[in-house]
Each structure stands twice: as C-alpha cells, then as structure tokens.
C-alpha cells in the first residue's frame, strides 16, 4: 500500500481467483483514543471499532472510502483504490491501446518545435468517474523539472457503437535550450483513476523524436506563362523554432485530386517554393519536416489548383 | 590550438556540403548497425546516451546562433560564446567566436575518428565478421576535417592488448553512432546557419 495523495491510498493486488489479497491497517487521524467506529462509503454498517482498523483487501468491494467517526462526528477519511496485477502485468483497462507507433502505446506525445513544450494525449471509452493526474521530468535518477497542466477532455468521437474520449495535457520543460543535444529522455507519468481502480501509464522520449511541425503557412500560387506549371510558395509555420537557418525544414509538395488513388505530381524541396503541374479539380498540398532529424511530417496545408 | 587559415572559396559555403555528407553517412551507418545488430540493444530506446566529447569540447555552446544567446537556458553555467558571421574558413574576417565554434567541431570529429578507427580494428578481429565501419563514413569525417583546415596534434590511436569483447564492442558502436548522429545534426544546423549568415 502507498499514498497517492493526502488520504488516498493505492493497494497493489495480485489478481487471480482465490487470491489471498492484502492485509491493510487503517489509522484514524485523530488524537482521540476511545469510542471510534469505522464505516465504508455510504453504508452505516459499523465495520469495527478502535483507532485502527485491519481489513483484508481482495476485491473492489473491499475498496472505497473508509471513514472513522466518534459520536456521529466524522474524524477522518481514507480512500482505498486498487491497482491490479494479472500474470505479473499491471492492468491497463482504463486507456485504449493506440497501437501507433507500436503496440502497447497508451500515451502519445508531440512537440511543434524545440522549445521544450509538448502535448500528450490518450484515449478512453470511459465517460464518467474518471480522473487523471500528470507528472513529468527530464531523466529519472536526477530528475530535472517539467511542468504539466491539468489533463482536459480535448475531443469526443463516435467509433462504431462506442464513444471514444480523447484527453490531452500540455507540459513545458522548465529550462529548455532549443539547440541542446538531449542525452536524458523526458519521462511522462499519468495516474488514472476510474471509480476505485487505479492505473498508471508512462512514456519516455526525446523531444527530437516527437517533433511534428505545424503545416506551412500562407500557400500562394503563381501560374507560369505558356505552361501548365505553377509556382507554389509558402512560409515556415509561426510555431517553428528560430532562427530558421539553424532549425531548417524540408518540404514535400504534392498535387492530387480528391481521391488518394488518383495520379499525382510530387516533389521534395528545401526551399519555400516549387514548380508543379496543376490539374483541374486537384489541389496543391505542402507539408514540412525537420531537415536534419527525420521525425514526423506536419499535416498538409492545401490550396485548390484552380 | 591554431586559428583557422583563410582559404578563399568561390561559390557555396565549403563546409555545408561536407556536413550534409557527414550526416547522411552516419545515418546510413546507424541504420545498417540497427539492421545487422538486430539482436543487440541498438535502438535509441535501448542504449545509454553517452557523449564522448562531454567536458572536452563545447560545440553546442560555442556554435550557438546569435538569436539563442538571449535564452538563459542556453547560457547556463558557460561562457557566452556564439557565432557572429563568416563562412567556413573562407573569410579573413573570421571572428574569434567563429574560430572557436569551428575548432570545436574539428575536435569532435577528431575524437570520433579515433574512436571509430580503434573500434573498427577490433571489429576486424571478430571471427563472426558481423559488422564493420563504413569506409565512406570515415572518409567523409576526414573530408570535413580537411575542409575545416585546422592544424592540431594528432591523437594516437588507442591500442588494447587484451582480447576484445566483441559483444561490448558492438554495443559501444551503437552508443557511439547514436551520439555521433546527434552531433552531426548539430554540425549540419551550424553549417546551414553560417551559410545563411
């Protein structure tokens, strides 16, 4: 058993049929010594008396809010949550496996630049009685500070018969130099509580590996005389690290119709303009990637050909 | 340590091309190592990230773009040193800071060159003959060092009398290649910045 936060405790249980469970001793936070009784949740049934209560925690029915009283007055609470371990593996029932970039990916994180600011998100099908708490640091043995905000519900989607909820959190490394060469990874820890179930999820990464620039901005077309070619130009996204001559991007320019199976013109360039062949009903799209360290491509920025 | 010798160079900033080749060569070599040593811990997640130049050179700090010198986090516990202007030893006005930056890059390359050559000598003794260093990568390191045009004492190649542990050598190769790739990215960014200056 360990303390998650004040008056909230996590009991770690090996979860298998007829498991013996864990013996837990609760102590009432009071100077009083006599006439103390204990109840669980909203029930008025007295579970025991005395300053301490010893219970055998085996299942979710044994978890919940234990309250000690004296003469009708509440003295203190202890909330017990369960953390299940099945076949030596901690449960991951609350969050959905996103399977990208590999199996057992519950947290996904991205950074728009090298400023030390990043966003993580996760998915669940659970809609109520759900809380998240996020902590982060650079390195684990001698951790350096990363400040995370509160996790918020950022999107809701319908997936077949199920509703899927996306939560996200923004974090900022306290003292980040965009030009630094990372040798210690960022660690992100998410505590998830659904009703009386506790789970924790972690992710470890270097900012350089989660970079995904915003799409290029201000796409413009200029038809070339006596030719089917057009010159397309664009600018670096505002959110990208500066100076741009140090933090350079490379670009992919594509002309394609509405369907992905249609024919296309595609060219890669380090410049902020390119010449392509435009077709009727097609659109020109441009995306960006760090020129020197190949992490993710940005989303496409698009303009119609006509 | 000698200051750079001015060697006028027409056309493109001479070191940019070499630094691009360097990044390409080390990335290819790292990819090859990851494929060949698939049953060794050789991915970024599996290895310890060590920097053999730590406390010996200060490339990131010495080559910091002017715009980032206002960032306190980039200047923590170090002298304020940054690039002002210039091209790869091609200008007589090459500043002292510029020289410091380029000489730091040169020292990085020299240290990695010695490590890689020592390692390759060990790998050539491996009866499995599983992996060797790409001669192209070693050649590209040499070309960039020559383009940087510094005179510096040669570091003797480390020789070891004991029987090499090939497993450890291969893991060290992975660690070295990951670190060198990160440094090659920094070098490429620096050269691109100088080219634009």
């Amino acid at each position: 058993i360990w303390e998650l936060k004040k008056d909230v405790y996590v009991v770690e249980l090996d979860w298998y049929p007829d498991a013996p469970g864990e013996m837990v001793v609760l102590t009432c936070d009071t100077p009083e010594e006599d006439g103390i009784t204990w109840t669980l949740d909203q029930s008025s049934e007295v579970l025991g008396s005395g300053k301490t209560l010893t219970i055998q925690v085996k299942e979710f029915g044994d978890a919940g809010q234990y309250t000690c009283h004296k003469g009708g007055e509440v003295l203190s609470h202890s909330l017990l949550l369960l953390h299940k371990k099945e076949d030596g593996i901690w449960s991951t029932d609350i969050l959905k496996d996103q399977k990208e970039p590999k199996n057992k990916t519950f947290l996904r994180c991205e950074a728009k630049n090298y400023s030390g600011r990043f966003t993580c998100w996760w998915l669940t099908t659970i809609s109520t009685d759900l809380t998240f708490s996020v902590k982060s640091s650079r390195g684990s043995s001698d951790p350096q500070g990363v400040t995370c905000g509160a996790a918020t519900l950022s999107a809701e989607r319908v997936r077949g018969d199920n509703k899927e909820y996306e939560y996200s959190v923004e974090c900022q490394e306290d003292s980040a130099c965009p030009a630094a060469e990372e040798s210690l990874p960022i660690e992100v820890m998410v505590d998830a509580v659904h009703k009386l179930k506790y789970e924790n999820y972690t992710s470890s990464f270097f900012i350089r590996d989660i970079i995904k620039p915003d799409p290029p901005k201000n796409l413009q077309l200029k038809p070339l005389k006596n030719s089917r070619q057009v010159e397309v130009s664009w600018e670096y996204p505002d959110t990208w690290s500066t100076p741009h001559s140090y933090f350079s991007l490379t670009f992919c320019v594509q002309v394609q119709g509405k369907s992905k199976r249609e024919k296309k013109d595609r060219v890669f360039t380090d410049k902020t303009s390119a010449t392509v062949i435009c077709r009727k009903n097609a659109s020109i799209s441009v995306r960006a990637q760090d020129r020197y360290y190949s992490s993710s491509w940005s989303e496409w920025a698009s303009v119609p050909c006509s | 340590r000698n200051l750079p010798v001015a060697t006028p160079d027409p056309g493109m900033f001479p070191c940019l091309h070499h630094s691009q080749n360097l990044l390409r060569a080390v990335s290819n070599m790292l990819q090859k190592a990851r494929q060949t040593l698939e049953f060794y811990p050789c991915t970024s997640e599996e290895i310890d990230h060590e920097d053999i130049t730590k406390d010996k050179t200060s490339t990131v700090e010495a080559c910091l773009p002017l715009e980032l010198t206002k960032n306190e986090s980039c200047l923590n516990s170090r002298e304020t040193s940054f690039i002002t202007n210039g091209s790869c030893l091609a200008s007589r006005k090459t500043s002292f800071m510029m020289a410091l930056c380029l000489s730091s890059i040169y020292e990085d390359l020299k240290m990695y060159q010695v490590e890689f050559k020592t390692m390759n000598a060990k790998l050539l003794m491996d009866p499995k003959r599983q992996i060797f260093l790409d001669q192209n990568m070693l050649a590209v390191i040499d070309e960039l060092m020559q383009a940087l045009n510094f005179n510096s004492e040669t570091v003797p190649q480390k020789s070891s009398l004991e029987e090499p542990d090939f497993y450890k050598t291969k893991i060290k190769l992975c660690i070295l290649l990951h670190a060198f790739r990160i440094r090659a990215v920094t070098i490429d960014r620096v050269m691109s910045y100088l080219n634009a200056s």
Partner: antibody, heavy 118, light 107 residues
Framework: QVQLVQSGAEVKKPGSSVKVSCKAS????????LHWSRQAPGQGLEWMGW????????EYAPKFQGRVTITADESTSTAYMELSSLRSEDTAVYYC???????????WGQGTLVTVSS | DIVMTQSPLSLPVTPGEPASISCRAS??????LHWYQQKPGQQPRLLIA???QSISGVPSRFSGSGSGTDFTLTISSLQPEDFATYYC?????????FGQGTKVEIK
C-alpha cells in the same frame, strides 16, 4: 498485371516522320501519366515528354519541342508518339512508360527500334 | 537543364561482394532522384524512388541514399542477375534527365 505493349520496329528516311504506339492493359488508362523516352544504340536514356490521357495535357523536353507530338486515345487505351523531321541521330529504341506519379516511371514498354537511314 | 553525372561508368565486381554507384546532380535536387536497372535488350526497371524509398518486388539488397547533390545506389551482395546497367534520374524539374549509366560487370 499492368502492361505496355509497343508497336514494331520501323525504318525511316531522313526528313520523314514516325508514329510509335503504346497500348496499355491492366488498370484504367486515364489513371496514369504516360511518358516517352529514347535510348540511342549503346547510349543512355533521354526523356522526351509526357501526356495526361485524362485531359490531353502534354509537356515536352525543350530539345524535342516542335518536333514531337504525344497523343492518347482513351477508347483504345493507346498512346502515340510522333517524331517529325527525322535525322540519323534519331535512331534509337523508343520507350513508353507510365506511373500514377508524374515524374518517374514504374512500368515500361518493351521498346520500339526506329532506324533512320537513307 | 539539370545534368546528372554517374560514376564509375564501369564497375567490375565479384559476385557476392557489395557494389556502390554514385550519382551527382549539377544543382541541389533534394531527394528527387530515382534509380533504374536495365539488362541488355530489355526495358528499364524501377529499383528505388525518391533517393531511398524501396519499391515492392525489388530485393532488399538494393538500397539508396543521399540528398541534395550526392546520391548512392548500394547493392549489398551482388547476385548473378544483378549484372546490368544502372541509371539515376532526377525529378526535381522538367526536363527530366538521366545519368549516363553505370555498367556493373563480373570481375
């Protein structure tokens, strides 16, 4: 299985024209760009131009501009390359090639030898 | 026009040994570079697209690298069927241009 089948070898006199055909099978004809390139005996490849069979748009290499015409007939899934004012240096194997990507070629025809000789 | 220069023009290799072919562009072409193989009396065959993207059906011993002006096609271990002429082609701008070819011959 996508295939491009070209017409047979031709012998032409200097100053005349030649029209080589390229019939496509497998896949929808207008879903691909079609290119023509040539290869003189013992020499490298030289790109001549492309056509978009969907709308008839064409683009030619400046070297061949005014002398080459590329056309396409969607009803027969056939593309044609006509080269006029032939000279002896036009002796080459002419290839058609296609791709959904405009700028490179993933399927090639077997080639047509055009010999220009007086 | 962008001029593509291949080297060497002839490359004698022992079967089972690796081979590398270089292709240089007269100006920067990013990764807009493709590789083809051509055997005598046959049409060219696409091997690599955009400098390093493998093509389905092409053996994994063929790999490409490079960007900007310098590119390399590598064959990790030459098989008897790999003896052929190899061409690079730039797609950065029209007109599309090819290298002059590298003939890989049995040593």
């Amino acid at each position: 299985q996508v295939q491009l089948v070209q017409s047979g070898a031709e012998v032409k006199k200097p100053g005349s024209s030649v029209k080589v055909s390229c019939k496509a099978s497998g896949g929808t004809f207008s879903d691909y760009y079609l290119h023509w390139s040539r290869q003189a005996p013992g020499q490298g490849l030289e790109w001549m131009g492309w056509i978009d069979p969907e709308n008839g748009d064409t683009e030619y290499a400046p070297k061949f501009q005014g002398r080459v015409t590329i056309t396409a007939d969607e009803s027969t899934s056939t593309a044609y390359m006509e080269l006029s004012s032939l000279r002896s240096e036009d002796t080459a194997v002419y290839y058609c090639a296609r791709n959904k990507e405009l700028r490179y070629f993933d399927v090639w025809g077997q080639g047509t030898l055009v010999t220009v000789s007086s | 026009d962008i001029v593509m220069t291949q080297s060497p023009l002839s490359l004698p290799v022992t079967p089972g040994e690796p081979a590398s072919i270089s292709c240089r562009a007269s100006q920067s072409i990013s990764i807009n570079l493709h590789w083809y193989q051509q055997k005598p009396g046959q049409q060219p065959r696409l091997l690599i697209a955009f400098a390093s993207q493998s093509i389905s059906g092409v053996p994994s011993r063929f790999s490409g690298s490079g960007s900007g002006t310098d590119f390399t096609l590598t064959i990790s271990s030459l098989q008897p069927e790999d003896f052929a002429t190899y061409y690079c082609q730039q797609s950065n701008s029209f007109p599309l241009t090819f290298g002059q070819g590298t003939k890989v011959e049995i040593k």
